[in-house]
């Protein structure tokens, strides 16, 4: 039998210091440029070497990026998410979303996050 | 210190070929979507062609079949081939990276990237 996957969805508060060039990750998405279908959220497409977000380590290629400074992300352009970034000033607050994969086993098994029983 | 440094620009007939070199320091260069930009006298300046950190590429019309924008990773250097070259290709060319944007079409459409090179000038006259 196959497997099912699901996903495991968590949200967490990150904390980053701009360095000489910037976060130290790229995004993709907005209204204009839906990374995912249906959805024009912020993704974090690529984490730089040595840069804050690496250094940290928590944030993760394929991240959502709910906030910025407490300012929300929905609906924008992509431009306009960019231009957040950018103007964020020293001190950064992320809220992200991270969406773990996990392989449950065959259909019809409970899995272990499975809350009935 | 982030820094790029653009070469190969020159005088080139109508119909030729330039090959334009932009050297990265400071960073690494496959970490960023990076392009390049052009700018004519009395005119705004013009994204001409851009490439994302994954290698997705976006041409400007007006070059689309004679530019081609690759990367060289070890080398750490952007290029531009320019081929068959005409008078109105005659800018100061510039080679910029956005910090956070990994989306080549909105790179060449911004007017807000964050490290610039000094440019290097292509003339096409005859």
């Known amino acids: 039998m196959n497997g099912r996957v699901d996903y495991l969805v968590t949200e967490e508060e990150i904390n980053l210091t701009r360095g000489p060039s910037g976060l130290g990750f790229n995004i993709v998405g907005g209204t204009d440029q839906q990374y995912v279908s249906n959805d024009s959220g912020i993704y974090v497409s690529r984490i730089k070497e040595n840069g804050a977000a690496a250094l940290d380590g928590r944030l993760q290629e394929g991240d959502k990026i709910l906030s910025v400074n407490g300012q929300d992300l929905k609906n924008l352009l992509h431009q306009d998410a960019v231009d957040l970034f950018r103007n964020a000033g020293y001190a950064v607050s992320l809220r992200v979303q991270h969406r773990l994969q996990v392989q449950n086993g065959p259909i019809g098994h409970r899995g272990e996050g499975d809350p009935s029983g | 210190e982030v820094q790029l440094v653009e070469s190969g620009g020159g005088l080139v007939q109508p119909g030729g070929s330039l090959r334009l070199s932009c050297a990265a320091s400071?960073?690494?260069?496959?970490?960023?979507?990076i392009g390049w930009f052009r700018q004519a006298p009395g005119k705004e300046r013009e994204g001409v062609s851009c490439i994302s950190s994954h290698g997705s590429t976006y041409y400007a019309d007006s070059v689309k079949g004679r530019f081609t924008i690759s990367r060289d990773n070890v080398k750490n250097t952007l290029y531009l081939q320019m081929n068959s070259l005409k008078p109105e290709d005659t800018a100061l060319y510039y080679c910029?990276?956005?910090?956070?944007?990994?989306?080549?079409?909105?790179?060449?459409?911004?007017?807000?990237?964050?490290?610039w090179g000094q440019g290097t000038q292509v003339t096409v006259s005859s």
């Open positions: 910029a990276a956005s910090y956070y944007s990994d989306y080549e079409v909105a790179v060449c459409r911004s007017d807000a990237l964050d490290a």
């Open positions: 400071g960073f690494t260069l496959d970490d960023y979507a």
